[in-house]
């Protein structure tokens, strides 16, 4: 693999990792590939602190997250645990809610207008946050 | 000068195996993600397969998901597609691009293109 | 897969005309959708991505806007060497599709 020793243009670095923010909305799964195309992921966060830096620069817009339930459990898609690490959900979400009448629950977790998660419909196209580390050899993940 | 040259195209039979390659130069190579797009004789454009800079990720069209692979070895600025299984609508001149930079998959610079002819 | 249809299949027109051709998705999106052009045994070539935003090299004389399923590409003042074909492209979801191409010719 080969090391990111710094952040590609349009990129913004923070504690050694890079963000891009995106100015325009696509499905979850969507904004997911568009990321994996970048050799990034969806924003995994890992602390209060991430939280904060993310929320200054998205402001008050739904934007997805790399957190889902599609196959059952909550996870991260970097493989971060999600029992044990950082959440910061609105009172009352994760709900699963039913009642959108779009079929099916909210398997797709977002930033919400204050910065709180909630889940939502995937195929809602909301604006996304792409994050890679800085110094670490990319992985080779599975083929999509 | 950016510049894409494909290689490794040629008549082939139904079933059999081809691999192309494209070179790349004039850009830093490991840093774009590639396609591959496919244009049948008289037809219209395809987007085939997509590969991220590192070679982590890659994405297909269904028409060619489990026959065809996308690689690239960065040392050597090279894209490659592997493909087998071979069929008569896999007939087509095949082209290789490169992305722009923060967009998805608008493709900016283009090879000149590798005729692949599927045909007993 | 998102479809994509373009209107009309092929035109005929002179040096100088307006030139509008417009692009359908079988689903909305925003701002992922490119226009490219294509003459006779060569690669194609990016004129437009973003909907709107102009390829470096390209003339200002090409423009491109729409939202939603409806995009259009239009040529202010149609030139002897704009005379090709036009295709767009989505790339807001894998597979990221083309339209069949529209043939600009001479009248």
């Known amino acids: 693999g080969s090391e990111r020793t710094c952040c590609p243009v349009n990129w913004v670095e923070h504690e050694r990792s890079c963000y891009w923010f995106s100015r325009s909305g696509k499905a979850w799964a969507d904004a997911d590939n568009y990321c994996r195309l970048e050799d990034a992921h969806l924003v995994v966060v890992t602390s209060w602190e991430e939280q904060k830096f993310v929320q200054h620069h998205i402001g008050p817009v739904n934007t997805w997250m790399g957190l889902h339930d599609q196959n059952g459990p909550w996870k991260w898609v970097d493989g971060t645990d999600y029992e044990t690490g950082f959440k910061n959900w609105r009172p009352e979400q994760p709900d699963d809610w039913y009642g959108h009448g779009l079929g099916g629950g909210e398997d797709c977790a977002h930033f919400t207008d204050d910065g709180r998660w909630n889940d939502d419909v995937c195929q809602r196209p909301y604006r996304w946050v792409c994050e890679t580390e800085l110094d670490k050899a990319s992985q080779e993940p599975p083929l999509l | 000068e950016v510049q894409l040259l494909e290689s490794g195209g040629g008549l082939i039979q139904p079933g059999g195996s081809l691999r192309l390659s494209c070179a790349a130069s004039g850009f830093t190579f490991r840093s774009y993600a590639m396609s591959w797009v496919r244009q049948a004789p008289g037809k219209g454009l395809e987007w085939v397969s997509a590969?991220?800079?590192?070679?982590?990720?890659?994405f297909y069209a269904d028409s060619v998901k489990g026959r065809f692979t996308i690689s690239r070895d960065n040392s050597k600025n090279t894209l490659y597609l592997q493909m087998n299984t071979l069929r008569a609508d896999d007939t087509a001149v095949y082209y290789c691009?490169?992305?722009?930079?923060?967009?998805?998959?608008?493709?900016?610079?283009w090879g000149q293109g590798t005729l692949v002819t599927v045909s007993s | 897969d998102i479809q994509m249809t373009q209107s009309p299949s092929s035109l005929s027109a002179s040096v100088g005309d307006r030139v509008t051709i417009t692009c359908r998705a079988s689903q909305s999106f925003s701002h992922y959708l490119n226009w490219y052009q294509q003459k006779p045994g060569k690669a194609p070539n990016l004129l437009i991505f973003a909907v709107s935003s102009l390829q470096s090299g390209v003339p200002s004389r090409f423009s491109g806007s729409g939202s939603g399923t409806d995009f259009t590409l239009t040529i202010s003042s149609l030139q002897p060497e704009d005379f090709a074909i036009y295709f767009c492209?989505?790339?807001?979801?894998?597979?990221?599709?083309f339209g069949p191409g529209t043939k600009v010719d001479i009248k």
């Open positions: 691009a490169k992305k722009v930079v923060d967009t998805a998959m608008a493709l900016d610079y």
């Open positions: 492209q989505q790339s807001y979801s894998t597979p990221f599709t």
């Open positions: 590969i991220s800079g590192s070679g982590g990720n890659t």
